[in-house]
Interface confidence: low
């Protein structure tokens, strides 16, 4: 599923991401835009053999199990395939664990490079939330 900007903002808000660990909703929508272009089915292979999955591009080395990443820790205790669902519950729940891990949203390279320090509120402007 490819979400609309405001559609995703509403879904993320419903799942409790607004101001989760101090990060406003705009941060999460911005991260999703530059990680996956709002596509729940996005996958990208990394040079270390791991793969990033879903709308928030969650990595199989640490967070989920895809049966194909040597040394996977699966800290979210989920199959990576769950992160590709049009239902973002699994991605959101895992993202909450990631953002609580110490580095906050710096864990997402796209957020660090494209969203951090910018007017992230622009990503939810005009949305009926």
């Amino acid at each position: 599923k490819v979400f609309g900007r405001c559609e995703l903002a509403a879904a993320m808000k419903r799942h409790g991401l607004d101001n989760y660990r101090g990060y406003s909703l705009g941060n999460w929508v911005c991260a999703a835009k530059f990680e996956s272009n709002f596509n729940t089915q996005a996958t990208n292979r990394n040079t270390d053999g791991s793969t990033d999955y879903g709308i928030l591009q969650i990595n199989s080395r640490w967070w989920c199990n895809d049966g194909r990443t040597p040394g996977s820790r699966n800290l979210c205790n989920i199959p990576c395939s769950a992160l590709l669902s049009s239902d973002i519950t699994a991605s959101v729940n895992c993202a909450k664990k990631i953002v609580s891990d110490g580095n906050g949203m710096n864990a997402w390279v796209a957020w660090r490079n494209r969203c951090k320090g910018t007017d992230v509120q622009a990503w939810i402007r005009g949305c009926r939330l």
Epitope: T43, G49, D66, G67, P70
Partner: antibody, heavy 115, light 107 residues
Framework: QVQLQESGAEVMKPGASVKISCKAT????????IEWVKQRPGHGLEWIGE????????YYNEKFKGKATFTADTSSNTAYMQLSSLTSEDSAVYYC?????????WGQGTTLTVS | DIELTQSPATLSVTPGDSVSLSCRAS??????LHWYQQKPHESPRLLIK???QSMSGIPSRFSGSGSGTDFTLSINSVETEDFGMYFC?????????FGGGTKLEIK
């Protein structure tokens, strides 16, 4: 139950192209990798590459880049592999399999003869 | 690419014998090694995943062991239905590679 049904045997002329299909049933097609494997007598099993149908992401064995092209149709739960510029070296049995690092489910194989 | 070398190429046994098939990797692959059985004109069948995890429906006489570069598939008291080809496969890195196979045949 999980099943992978491949298309039937093909006899092709050198230089032609062929498209082999693999219809998946019994699981969520979009979220598992489909692998393609070549088997020739005396050459064992060779991994050609893989496609994740939901995203269209593909990864190829360098040896088969330019030879094989993977596509998938999520409306029919079918993966395809096209082989181009066929030569006698392409004569083989081609398998699709569901990929989880290991391959627990396989198609029955498609025999390709190039002559 | 990681090379997998299987030995012996052919193993002639009598039903009831116990046998060991070897798979050696050109570099360490941790436990990311899987075993398949293939009968003539059939697709491969996964027997053991991740070195030692038996698949459901596979007889308990099949077991796997090893780590790093040396792996073994053991068949305790071979039965006539066990004859065929056996392949190992690694999932430690891309491209995925298979061993050349061991043919288990009746003596």
């Amino acid at each position: 139950q999980v099943q992978l049904q491949e298309s039937g045997a093909e006899v092709m002329k050198p230089g032609a192209s062929v498209k082999i299909s693999c219809k998946a049933t019994g699981y969520t097609f979009t979220t598992y990798w489909i692998e393609w494997v070549k088997q020739r007598p005396g050459h064992g099993l060779e991994w050609i590459g893989e496609i994740l149908p939901g995203s269209g992401s593909t990864y190829y064995n360098e040896k088969f880049k330019g030879k094989a092209t993977f596509t998938a149709d999520t409306s029919s739960n079918t993966a395809y592999m096209q082989l181009s510029s066929l030569t006698s070296e392409d004569s083989a049995v081609y398998y699709c399999a569901r990929g989880d690092g290991h391959y627990g489910y396989w198609g029955q194989g498609t025999t390709l003869t190039v002559s | 690419d990681i090379e997998l070398t299987q030995s012996p190429a052919t193993l002639s046994v009598t039903p009831g014998d116990s046998v060991s098939l070897s798979c050696r990797a050109s570099q360490s692959i941790s436990n990311n090694l899987h075993w398949y059985q293939q009968k003539p004109h059939e697709s491969p069948r996964l027997l053991i995943k991740y070195t030692s995890q038996s698949m459901s429906g596979i007889p308990s006489r099949f077991s796997g062991s090893g780590s790093g570069t040396d792996f073994t598939l053991s068949i305790n008291s071979v039965e006539t239905e066990d004859f065929g080809m056996y392949f190992c496969q690694q999932s430690n890195s891309w491209p995925r590679t298979f061993g050349g196979g061991t043919k288990l045949e009746i003596k």
